[in-house]
């Protein structure tokens, strides 16, 4: 009778992660008597995948009943495939022997390749906020994909970016891979509503790329512009001075009025108006009792925005030149409010 051959008809099998792999194997004869075993890899370090008679292999099932008389189909199914299962699988026939069974004949092997989807890209920006005209770096990471080929693109508000560097690790053969990319983005004053998008395309995604986003509102700081103006007299001996704080982001802002360098009042921006570009405006006003001053008054609006060093704008109030106006003689006071309460 012809000597037994072990036939593995599939040279390679491609399976998606999470699916079941079927590895086919048939023998051409029932002789010699002995079990079939499946291994991943060859040589002394090979890994036992299935032994039909003993051991624990919860992920493996046989395609046919191996104990049926005259069965020569030794195909197996491996469930819940992960990238770690990739490799070459050998169906090996053993001959019963003493003390141990002896390897008799091996199949040619079936290479199992696993396609695994990349994880959702995670985009992270700089730890500290930056101001317009500065360049900031964003990183994008995705893990666990196989095969290694992958495409990564960066966008800002739908416009593709070109200033980025990408690495896929490891460089050599691996069960799965990771991608890491760093993009440089120049901030503009209009970027409060902007988004940076990292897009990853891979064979497992069937043309539907994964995206990770970062909002530039988390990254940008737009410093305010200040304007101090003197309003017409509201009452006898009183001058209304306003400080317009324009186009700032984020909202965290504290304003201090100084009269001739002395703190008059401090307030925190509360009811602000939002501009179309996402920045904020706010206004504070101060009633100055002119009669309390003999000399000219230097009024300073000092603003501390988002924990940054204070910026200020001053206005010189000429006491001597101030005309008197008819009207009720209210008590001299310093009051402040936001835009809503001026009129």
């Amino acid at each position: 009778e012809e000597e037994l051959q072990v036939i593995q008809p599939d040279k390679s099998v491609l399976v998606a992660a999470g699916e079941t792999a079927t590895l086919r194997c048939t023998a051409t004869s029932l002789i010699p008597v002995g079990p079939i075993q499946w291994f991943r890899g060859a040589g002394p370090g090979r890994e036992l995948i299935y032994n039909q008679k003993e051991g624990h292999f919860p992920r493996v099932t046989t395609v046919s009943d191996l104990t049926k008389r005259n069965n020569m189909d030794f195909s197996i199914r491996i469930g819940n495939i992960t990238p770690a299962d990739a490799g070459t699988y050998y169906c090996v026939k053993f001959r019963k022997g003493s003390p141990d069974d002896v390897e008799f004949k091996s199949g040619a092997g079936t290479e199992l390749s696993v396609r695994a989807k990349p994880s959702a890209p995670v985009v992270s920006g700089p730890a500290a906020r930056a101001t317009p005209q500065h360049t900031v770096s964003f990183t994008c990471e995705s893990h666990g994909f196989s095969p290694r080929d992958i495409t990564l693109k960066w966008f800002k508000n739908g416009n593709e970016l070109s200033d980025f560097q990408t690495n896929v690790d490891p460089v050599g053969e691996s069960v799965s891979y990771s991608i890491h990319s760093t993009a440089k983005v120049v901030l503009t004053r209009e970027d409060v509503h902007s988004q940076v998008i990292c897009e990853v395309a891979h064979v497992t995604l069937q043309g539907d790329p994964l995206r990770g986003t970062a909002n530039l509102s988390e990254t940008i700081r737009v410093p305010p512009t200040l304007e101090v103006t003197q309003q017409p007299v509201r009452a006898e001996n009183q001058v209304n001075v306003t400080c317009q704080v324009r186009k700032f982001y984020p909202q965290r802002l504290q304003l201090t009025w100084l009269e001739n360098g002395n703190v008059s009042r401090t307030e925190t921006a509360s009811t602000v108006t939002e501009n179309k570009d996402g920045t904020y405006n706010w206004m504070s006003w101060l009633l100055v009792n002119v009669s309390a001053h003999r000399d000219d008054v230097k009024l300073t609006c000092q603003v501390e925005h988002d924990g940054q060093p204070a910026v200020s704008k001053s206005h010189d109030l000429k006491v001597s030149a101030h005309p008197k106006e008819q009207g009720s003689n209210t008590a001299a006071e310093n009051t402040g409010s936001n835009e809503r309460n001026i009129y």
Epitope: E47, L48, E54
Partner: antibody
């Protein structure tokens, strides 16, 4: 559900023979090797041997070779372990196990004069 | 015959502590054929870890196994009261199959 149910405790005199049974359910006994393991009181596990019920091929540990016989009856899905020329040091719990993964509850054999 | 030597013979620890149990083989054992069993008094052994590092069904993730060649380890990251038992390593790489003498993990 895989189950291995062993026969009850035995008390034997030195020189006697004991035969323990292990009836299995939830699988066909022909599909797996059936192993036997000894555990003397307060001691560790010791592998005795195994049978391939499909063709009755057996392997035994050198320590038990010549005194132990493992058999199987595929019609009743039962494995047996027979130990002869009993001595006091054979006093132990004997376990059957299916392919190293599932174990019977154990059978206590006491050898005493 | 491959002799498996487990150390220590007894390990006294408190719940919450990390336990490291060792199993040393007199000659090389393929990692596929190295199993660990847990046994409690009056009970049959239970398969705990198979093929060196794979947890049997229902075994908590605080257990892990590692090793290759002649040196294998079972680790419990943070001991729970139910983990105190005897643990045996077992090789079925070549006949006669052998067990280690066991490590008794007891409450300190």
């Amino acid at each position: 559900e895989v189950q291995l149910v062993q026969s009850g405790a035995e008390v034997k005199k030195p020189g006697a023979t004991v035969k323990i049974s292990c009836k299995v359910s939830g699988f066909n006994i022909k599909d797996y090797y059936m192993h036997w393991v000894q555990q003397a009181p307060g001691k560790g596990l010791e592998w005795i041997g195994r049978i391939d019920p499909e063709d009755a091929e057996t392997k035994y540990a050198p320590k038990f070779q010549g005194r132990v016989t493992i058999t199987a009856d595929t019609s009743t899905n039962t494995a047996y372990m027979e130990l002869s020329s009993l001595r006091s040091e054979d006093t132990a719990v004997y376990y059957c196990d299916r392919g190293l993964a599932y174990w019977g509850q154990g059978t206590l054999v006491t050898v005493s004069s | 015959e491959i002799v498996l030597t487990q150390s220590p013979a007894t390990l006294s620890l408190s719940p919450g502590e990390r336990a490291t149990l060792s199993c040393s083989a007199s000659s090389s054992v393929s990692s596929s054929y190295l199993y660990w069993y847990q046994q409690k008094p009056g009970q049959a052994p239970k398969l705990w870890i198979y093929s060196t590092s794979n947890l049997a069904s229902g075994i908590p993730a605080r257990f892990s196994g590692s090793g290759s060649g002649t040196d294998y380890t079972l680790t419990i990251s943070s001991l729970e009261p139910e983990d105190f038992a005897v643990y045996y390593c077992h090789q079925w790489s070549s006949y006669p199959y052998t067990f280690g003498q066991g490590t008794k993990l007891e409450i300190k």
